[in-house]
């Protein structure tokens, strides 16, 4: 006469996180009398998942009516699966006694949980960098399972190749994290550029997740300065302009110096934006040459985004102009509208 067998037909079952997992188990006999119990793992540290005889297991329901006479199906459904539920589940027949004794175990069913990766988070360097410099971007995504995952980097749709990726932990785990660092060389045209980290995983059904970083938060394009002199109708006045071109971000302070002495300081306000996202600004100084006996050295000094000042000077010749006593240097400024 054949002894009771515990049959777990599925060697493995894969379930998406949040769904229910059905673990199948049938027995071939009602003998001996005693409960079926389900465990996760084997050995002394195994975790009780369900006991037909007693206990409260809110996430577990029996697939067939376990109290039904002649029931030999002890399959269970575990609701709201999370990656922490992964493992091998054993259906075990116990023999009634004091205490109940283990009679026979099924071969086990390995439950793997498919968990979606979190939305990739891309972060750039703490400080801005200038064109021609190489900056690092990191991309992180967490909580996915199984471990296999693909990560790609793009800059404005072009795939990048200079990056390093790690998936942790290296060994078995209920869920995994990915960390990648990409190196990007900045150019002057990168104000409107985007760096994209793209993560593909079996749980995403071919629709990868993306994280983006705008290079506008990373790049600093230093301005170019040009100081020019334009005559005005009044023969004793000269208009000197300082063209500040192609800078980013907008934070900029300009100071005029006359022979090294501060004449006026102003902050860029009415700027014009170039197609590449950089800005232009123009400041002018109206110089009353009759107030000067000697040549004047005019300096346009620009402090951009907290960086050390850059300057451009212009020598103003005054020897040819008649001197008018009592005149002061006058200065007026309005925003310019030069676009490149």
């Amino acid at each position: 006469e054949e002894e009771l067998q515990v049959i777990q037909p599925d060697k493995s079952v894969s379930v998406a996180a949040g769904e229910s997992a059905i673990l199948h188990c049938t027995v071939t006999s009602l003998i001996p009398v005693g409960p079926i119990q389900w465990f996760r793992g084997a050995g002394p540290a195994r975790e009780l998942i369900y006991n037909q005889k007693e206990g409260h297991f809110p996430r577990v329901t029996t697939v067939s009516e376990s109290t039904k006479r002649e029931n030999m199906d002890f399959s269970i459904s575990i609701s709201n699966i999370t990656p922490a539920d992964a493992g091998t589940y054993y259906c075990v027949k116990f023999r009634k006694g004091s205490p109940d004794t283990e009679f026979k175990s099924g071969a086990g069913t390995e439950l793997s949980v498919r968990a979606k990766p979190s939305a990739p988070v891309v972060s750039g360097p703490a400080a801005r960098a200038t064109p021609q410099h190489t900056v690092s971007f990191t991309c992180e995504s967490h909580g996915f399972s199984p471990r296999d995952i693909t990560l790609k980097w793009f800059k404005n749709g072009n795939e990048l190749s200079d990056f390093q990726t790690n998936v942790d932990p290296v060994g078995e785990s209920v869920s995994y994290s990915i960390h990648s660092t990409a190196k990007v060389v900045l150019t002057r045209e990168d104000v409107h550029s985007q760096v994209i980290c793209e993560v593909a995983h079996v749980t995403l059904q071919g629709d990868p997740l993306r994280g983006t970083a705008n290079l506008s938060e990373t790049i600093r394009v230093p301005p170019t300065l040009e100081v020019t002199q334009q005559p005005v109708r009044a023969e004793n006045q000269v208009n000197v302009t300082c063209q500040v071109r192609k800078f980013y971000p907008q934070r900029l302070q300009l100071t005029w110096l006359e022979n090294g002495n501060v004449s006026r300081t102003e902050t860029a306000s009415t700027v014009t934006e170039n197609k590449d996202g950089t800005y232009n600004w123009m400041s002018w100084l109206l110089v009353n040459v009759s107030a000067h006996r000697d040549d004047v050295k005019l300096t346009c000094q620009v402090e951009h985004d907290g960086q050390p000042a850059v300057s451009k000077s212009h020598d103003l010749k005054v020897s040819a102009h008649p001197k008018e006593q009592g005149s002061n240097t006058a200065a007026e400024n309005t925003g310019s509208n030069e676009r490149n």
Partner: antibody
Framework: RQLVESGGGLVQPGGSLRLSCAAS????????ISWVRQAPGKGLEYIGT?????ITYYASWAKGRFTGSKTSSTAYLQMTSLRAEDTAVYYC????????????WGQGTLVTVSS | DIVMTQSPSSLSASVGDRVTITCQAS????????LAWYQQKPGQAPKLLIY???TLATGVPSRFSGSGSGTDFTLTISSLQPEDFATYYC???????????FGQGTKVEIK
């Protein structure tokens, strides 16, 4: 689905008797067969259960004198050293108790122990 | 061994009456629910009514119900029918697989 007992009758004190319980409509392979007796005018008394080879058990008072066995179609109860107080109707029933209750019963066979 | 005490030992009732029979175990039954109820009519084999304390056996009318856990159990017949006059037995199981004991029976007679 039914169980049919046979083998009862008159036996002298100290004698032996073997009862049979034939199943029809189902196999005994995956079911226990339990034996219950009822003395005249008295209540029911559990004797024991025959499962598979190693899974056979008896009430404490029945150990030693009562032995069960079964094939896929017939269960047996061997009774020895019979006494007058063993006089009863003997029933076989399908089941082992708890979640496997005694759901099918034979019609019973009367065993009379008398000299 | 577990001892099952049924009460009352007999009762008289009329058709349509609600009848309650109790069964008390000397210790908690196995799994707190190893308790079955059987009906026996004269000259017949017992018939399973309820098992696992409250599960109605196949083909048994719904007027029969079982309740209880641990040591105290009840069989209720909500509206007694003429065919229900019989003797009722509880069968309790202790922790040992051979420890199965019937109560002494409750005879339900016509008033």
């Amino acid at each position: 689905r039914q169980l049919v007992e046979s083998g009862g009758g008159l036996v002298q004190p100290g004698g032996s008797l073997r009862l049979s319980c034939a199943a029809s409509g189902f196999s005994l392979s995956s079911h226990g067969i339990s034996w219950v007796r009822q003395a005249p005018g008295k209540g029911l008394e559990y004797i024991g259960t025959i499962g598979t080879g190693v899974i056979t058990y008896y009430a404490s008072w029945a150990k030693g004198r009562f032995t069960g066995s079964k094939t896929s179609s017939t269960a047996y109860l061997q009774m020895t050293s019979l006494r007058a107080e063993d006089t009863a109707v003997y029933y076989c029933a399908r089941g082992s108790a708890w979640n496997d209750p005694f759901d099918y019963w034979g019609q019973g066979t009367l065993v009379t122990v008398s000299s | 061994d577990i001892v099952m005490t049924q009460s009352p030992s007999s009762l008289s009732a009329s058709v349509g009456d609600r009848v309650t029979i109790t069964c008390q175990a000397s210790q908690s039954v196995y799994g707190n629910n190893d308790l079955a109820w059987y009906q026996q009519k004269p000259g017949q084999a017992p018939k399973l009514l309820i098992y696992l304390a409250s599960t109605l056996a196949t083909g048994v009318p719904s007027r029969f119900s079982g309740s209880g856990s641990g040591t105290d159990f009840t069989l209720t017949i909500s509206s007694l029918q003429p065919e229900d006059f019989a003797t009722y037995y509880c069968l309790g199981g202790g922790d040992d697989e051979a420890d199965n004991t019937f109560g002494q029976g409750t005879k339900v007679e016509i008033k």
